[in-house]
């Protein structure tokens, strides 16, 4: 069944998530109208290869035309209108950047399949096996289900055979004892010689049959244990390992991890089969104690079978003890694995063997750096204590799906103070944000006479003492989880591995897509690659060191790539989220590319991008204008920082931005958001209506107050040759001498600092045509 059709049949809660996937950049109507064709194209390839993207984009327009003519024949006016509008939009937006639409479609299709997968898992748990989405199971998983079913069947068959062998043995035992008690066995010389001989033959025959049956059972048990071992290996080394890797990816902003319920069902099923088999092996021992003979296969093989089944069950239980939710501070949900001392963090463990008899039986204890006491001292790492409720009993009541879990909600870390200010050793080789720590969870299971020690641990965490360490700590978490699936390599940063651009690019995009509604486009990523690696054509496979990513300053800058980018991420999330979600912020674009795309556009066309020189994160706009001689000029305003955006929204800044020309008249240089979206259409909805800007006048006053409006104004000279930001205080001297402003951002054309005027309060009040 086509993916789009499957999606239509989903539950409302999933449909809501589906709606969130689609926006103006790729309208849902288009997805609906061209569903089969869209699903037949290789969008991921198109997203990485310009020539293919161009081809697919042109084919897309062709498909739209065909669909349009179908609507024409059906006289469907509304759909005709919508389709024409969509086509115009696509042409205006993606004709020059077809890889962008390819990336968007690829992402949507991928997210759709994830949604189907999630729904399928949920449906399976809810017993809706006939639901169309339940079919979304990989071939490998189907095989696994098959193997598990086979194991269950073999266990049941053995159960039957055990009953049969027990019956045969009881019958043999009865006959043997009867003959013995009647003294027939000594009576071979008596009158009943032939009858007794006959009975003896029957008895021997029964013993032979018993021996054969025992051998058959022992052999089948050995085969069953091998089958269990195979299924267990698949479950733990593949499925569970995949889940753990996906958890790592989800931790660093990647796609959300699939739910553990299906895995829990599989593991529980296998564990149940193992316990039943263990009982069968115990039964063999009982049978052997009742009847044994020379060459008895039970005597020979039972101890080894017992050992194997116990080992399998023990290992399964150990593997089934997992950290379902990695340590995370509730105030920083999108940055797990970074913990600040003295701040509460939460974490959750789960046992994927869902045995009701274990409810409230397992007491979990949490500790930190359990196995590295001496190592830590040698390495000079800090040492910590866990404070708060560090023991919890696992139960099935707290979780909404009845899983056997324990959630720790009130844990905090405190550093163990030593004489030298907290570091266990003065010559510590790693900075604190590269120091990795493990949170360990321990418990003991007593089940059917077995004692099993369970232990699991979190992914490595970075412990900070000040929130200003968060960016570097998060960089460490990104680098670790991007490059290794080793769950406990705390020495990772003593020799950090090198990443490739492809890996880094994906993770950087996740930093946006996980907390906003859009990731980074190929074009945006190429700009970032240029910043990290210098000019190049193909960055795929290029290597990036940990130092280059996070520690070394960028060329000509006083800060690292990551510090700069992290501040931009923060800026986006806190100040310009809605505009970013709409796709209005081009964000990362090189000067050359900016000039290239704007120079062909009419005056007043502008784009929004991030500052390259602002460490704290800044956003600016660049626009096209014509100078007196009619020559095209590209101008940029001095970047707005968080400080300024605290006082006024970026949308309002854009809407109100003016240039004061030589005749002191205020004009707005910003007309169309690139490529050709009218400014009001793009930003109007994000500005407060003027009526809301001030409270009504004091009812007791004679006349209402005059309304005021903050606007940003750039004073400019006629020549438009100022290359650097202008400070309001030094405007005169700058105009006279044109001296350099420090930390300025070189620009393609003029770069202006805007002065913010309050039209009522400032003495240098400018009249604005509002």
């Amino acid at each position: 069944m086509a993916q789009w059709n499957q999606l239509q049949q989903l539950d409302t809660r999933y449909l809501e998530q589906l709606h969130q996937l689609y926006s103006d950049s790729f309208p849902m109507e288009l997805r609906q109208f061209l569903a089969p064709w869209i699903e037949s194209q290789d969008w991921a390839y198109a997203a990485s290869k310009e020539s293919h993207a161009t081809l697919v984009f042109h084919n897309l327009l062709g498909e739209i035309d065909q669909q349009y003519s179908r609507f024409l024949q059906e006289s469907n006016v509304l759909y005709q209108h919508n389709l024409r509008r969509i086509k115009q939009f696509l042409q205006s937006r993606y004709l020059e950047k077809p890889m962008e639409i390819a990336r968007i479609v690829a992402r949507c299709l991928w997210e759709e399949s994830r949604l189907l997968q999630t729904a399928a898992t949920a449906a399976q748990q809810g017993g809706q096996a006939n639901h169309p989405t339940a079919a979304v199971v990989t071939e490998k998983q189907q095989m696994l289900e098959q193997h598990l079913q086979d194991v269950r069947k073999r266990v049941q068959d053995l159960e039957q055979k055990m009953k049969v062998v027990e019956n045969l043995q009881d019958d043999f035992d009865f006959n043997y004892k009867t003959l013995k008690s009647q003294g027939d066995m000594q009576d071979l010389n008596g009158n009943n010689q032939s009858v007794t001989r006959q009975k003896m033959q029957q008895l021997e025959q029964m013993l032979t049959a018993l021996d054969q049956m025992r051998r058959s059972i022992v052999s089948e048990l050995a085969g069953l244990l091998s089958a269990m071992e195979y299924v267990q290996k698949t479950l733990t080394d593949e499925e569970l390992a995949d889940w753990k890797r996906r958890q790592q990816i989800a931790c660093i902003g990647g796609p959300p991890n699939i739910c553990l319920d299906r895995l829990e069902n599989w593991i529980t099923s296998l564990a149940e089969s193992q316990l039943q088999t263990r009982q069968q092996i115990k039964k063999l021992e009982e049978l052997q104690q009742k009847v044994s003979y020379k060459g008895d296969p039970i005597v020979q093989h039972r101890p080894m079978l017992e050992e194997r089944i116990v080992e399998l069950f023990r290992n399964l239980m150990k593997s089934a003890f997992v950290v379902e939710r990695q340590p995370c501070m509730p105030m920083h949900p999108d940055r797990p694995l970074v913990i600040k001392t003295g701040v509460q963090f939460t974490t959750k463990v789960r046992l994927l063997v869902k045995f009701p008899e274990l409810n409230y039986q397992l007491k979990i204890k949490v500790c930190i750096d359990k196995d590295s006491g001496d190592v830590a001292a040698l390495r000079g790492s800090r040492k910590f204590n866990i404070l708060g409720t560090n023991t919890k009993v696992m139960n099935m009541e707290e979780s909404n799906n009845g899983s056997l879990s324990a959630e720790f909600k009130h844990l905090t870390l405190r550093e163990q103070r030593c004489g030298n200010g907290g570091r266990a050793n003065c010559d510590a080789s790693l900075i604190v944000t590269e120091e990795l720590h493990l949170i360990t969870f321990e418990t003991e299971v007593y089940h059917q006479g077995l004692k099993i020690d369970l232990e699991t641990h979190s992914l490595p965490v970075v412990v900070i003492s000040n929130i200003c360490q968060m960016p570097n700590a998060w960089a460490s978490i990104l680098w670790y989880n991007m490059l290794t699936n080793n769950p406990k390599n705390v020495n990772f940063f003593t020799k950090p591995p090198i990443g490739t651009w492809d890996q880094v690019a994906e993770v950087l995009s996740w930093q946006f897509s996980s907390t906003t509604k859009r990731g980074l486009s190929i074009e945006q990523l190429t700009t970032l690659a240029e910043k990290l690696l210098g000019p190049g054509v193909n960055y795929s496979g290029c290597q990036i060191t940990w130092a280059k990513f996070c520690k070394e300053n960028m060329a000509g800058k006083g800060f690292s790539f990551w510090v700069w980018l992290d501040n931009i991420i923060d800026l986006v999330k806190k100040y310009i989220l809605a505009l970013w979600n709409e796709g209005y912020i081009m964000g990362f674009i090189s000067k050359e590319r900016e000039r290239a795309i704007l120079s062909t556009k009419p005056p007043g066309t502008f784009l929004l991008r991030f500052s390259e020189s602002s460490k704290e994160g800044g956003v600016t706009f660049t626009w096209v204008e014509k100078d007196i001689s009619g020559k095209t000029q590209i101008q940029s305003v001095e970047p707005y920082t968080k400080q300024q955006l605290n006082n006024m929204s970026f949308a309002e800044i854009i809407m109100g931005y003016k240039i004061m020309d030589a005749t002191n008249i205020l004009v707005s240089p910003l007309v169309y958001l690139y490529p050709d979206i009218p400014k009001e259409e793009a930003f109007g909805k994000y500005c407060r209506p003027e009526s809301q800007e001030h409270p009504e006048a004091d009812p007791g006053s004679a006349a209402p107050y005059l309304k005021t409006k903050f606007i940003c104004v750039t004073p400019t000279t006629c020549s438009n040759t100022i290359d650097l930001p202008m400070s309001p205080r030094t405007l005169d001297s700058l105009m006279q001498f044109g001296n350099n402003g420090e930390g300025a951002e070189p620009s393609a054309g003029g770069q202006f600092e805007s002065l913010t005027f309050d039209m009522e309060l400032t003495s240098e009040c400018a009249t604005s045509p509002m």
């Epitope: 039957q160 049969v164 019956n167 045969l168 019958d171 009865f174 009867t178 009975k199 049959a209 049956m213």
Partner: nanobody
Amino acid sequence: EVQLVESGGGSVQAGGSLRLSCVASTYTGCMGWFRQAPGKEREGVAALSSRGFAGHYTDSVKGRFSISRDYVKNAVYLQMNTVKPEDAAMYYCAAREGWECGETWLDRTAGGHTYWGQGTLVTVSS
């Protein structure tokens, strides 16, 4: 589920001999033979319990028919001697998991589940 497969049926002259065999898919405590002549009800012929090795026979075949088992092969045999025309019938192998298979089973008043074979036909020519 126990599967039973009979063999050995065929035509035999009155006063002659015939040996019927039945192999079971698994061990059962009780195995025996029943028969059904056209237009008549099914009746018990002979049964052998795994306990005590004693065979039980319906009166009409006592001294002529003999039942035996091979525990290794999970088989039961019916040796038919001095066959009479009234012995002609469809012969069914039967088995049950319990070991009690005396007269109560043969006259089909015993409880418990009985497994049946497809039957093998015995005809008697005079």
